[in-house]
């Protein structure tokens, strides 16, 4: 998982998906950063089924899954006046091949060739009210909500850190938006995939 | 706009059974995010459970394993099964409502279940 560092005017929050932004009428697009598969507990089912980039018979090769989870936005001592509710990106994109094992005779399912990762694609902003102890006034924040899941590609440029979206040659590149920081916490929770569609 | 209420509380004794249901009103119900939230006397509300349209779910720990969600969208209904049930069950349940990716703006107003031991 991809340690960030804090910058001033952000606040991380508990999951990887959900973090404050600016009070803004508009805010740029995240820059397409690699997502943690081990995040909220105990989702299961997972939504929507996942995307089928590759022409293959064999579905279950693909698990980019949307896993929805439900809780209340903390920032430190303060937390949201009502819960929320949204999407965990989970699994591994693209087809897993059988490659032989080294140590034993037995084959191991590894991925091969281009790196894909499942990652949020779509966000909703969506304002919250922090209560905070102490006989705080509450504060009024924009959280950004997980909406959509894709398969991106993770390229050589940027220091690996641009991804490109499933079947096409360049990442397309977003007009007068610059990508901007995001504060993440570190710690997160194990999802569960149970039963998964 | 969705209304809910609840139902189905009551007295239950340790390691007993109830069955919640959040009723709904109002044609755009199949969309919503639904979840059972609780609120034991002197604590903040928690998370229980939750369910989207179609059918993925979400448990928070204190009931997995023991609770269960589901729901009947051509009944506009959403039901949380509770087995095996314990006194610190007991609580103020609220089932609430939510756009996907979005604030649970909605809410009935409770159900109370109690757990005598």
């Known amino acids: 998982h991809h340690h960030h560092h804090h910058h001033q005017g952000w606040q991380a929050f508990k999951n990887d998906a959900t973090e404050i932004i600016p009070e803004l009428g508009e805010y740029p697009e995240p820059p397409p950063e690699l997502e943690n598969n081990k995040t909220m507990n105990r989702a299961e089912n997972g939504g929507r089924p996942p995307h089928h980039p590759f022409e293959t018979k064999d579905v279950s090769e693909y698990s980019c899954r949307e896993l929805h989870f439900t809780r209340y936005v903390t920032d430190g001592p303060c937390r949201s006046a009502k819960p929320v509710t949204e999407l965990v990106c989970s699994g591994q994109c693209g087809p897993a091949r059988l490659l032989p094992n080294a140590i034993g005779r037995g084959k191991w399912w590894r991925p091969s060739g281009p790196d894909f990762r499942c990652i949020p694609d779509r966000y909703r902003a969506q304002r919250v009210q922090l209560l905070c102890p102490g006989g705080e006034a509450p504060r009024a924040r924009k959280v950004r909500l997980v909406a959509s899941c894709k398969c991106k590609r993770l390229t050589r440029f940027h220091n690996q850190s641009e991804l490109k979206d499933f079947g096409t040659e360049a990442a397309r590149p977003q007009k007068g938006r610059k990508p901007r920081p995001r504060a993440r916490s570190a710690k997160a929770n194990q999802a569960e995939l149970e039963n998964a569609y | 706009e969705v209304q809910l209420v609840e139902s189905g509380g009551g007295l239950v004794q340790a390691g007993g059974s109830l069955r919640l249901t959040c009723a709904a009103s109002?044609?755009?119900?199949?969309?919503?995010?639904i979840g059972w939230f609780r609120q034991a006397p002197g604590k903040q509300r928690e998370v229980v459970a939750s369910i989207t349209s179609g059918g993925s779910t979400y448990y928070e720990d204190s009931g997995k394993g023991r609770f269960t969600i589901s729901r009947d969208n051509a009944k506009n209904r959403v039901y949380l099964q509770m087995n095996s049930l314990r006194p610190e069950d007991t609580a103020v349940y609220y089932c609430a409502a939510a756009e996907p990716a979005g604030v649970y703006d909605v809410w009935g107003q409770g159900t109370q279940v109690t757990v005598s031991s």
């Open positions: 109002g044609r755009t119900f199949s969309s919503f995010v």
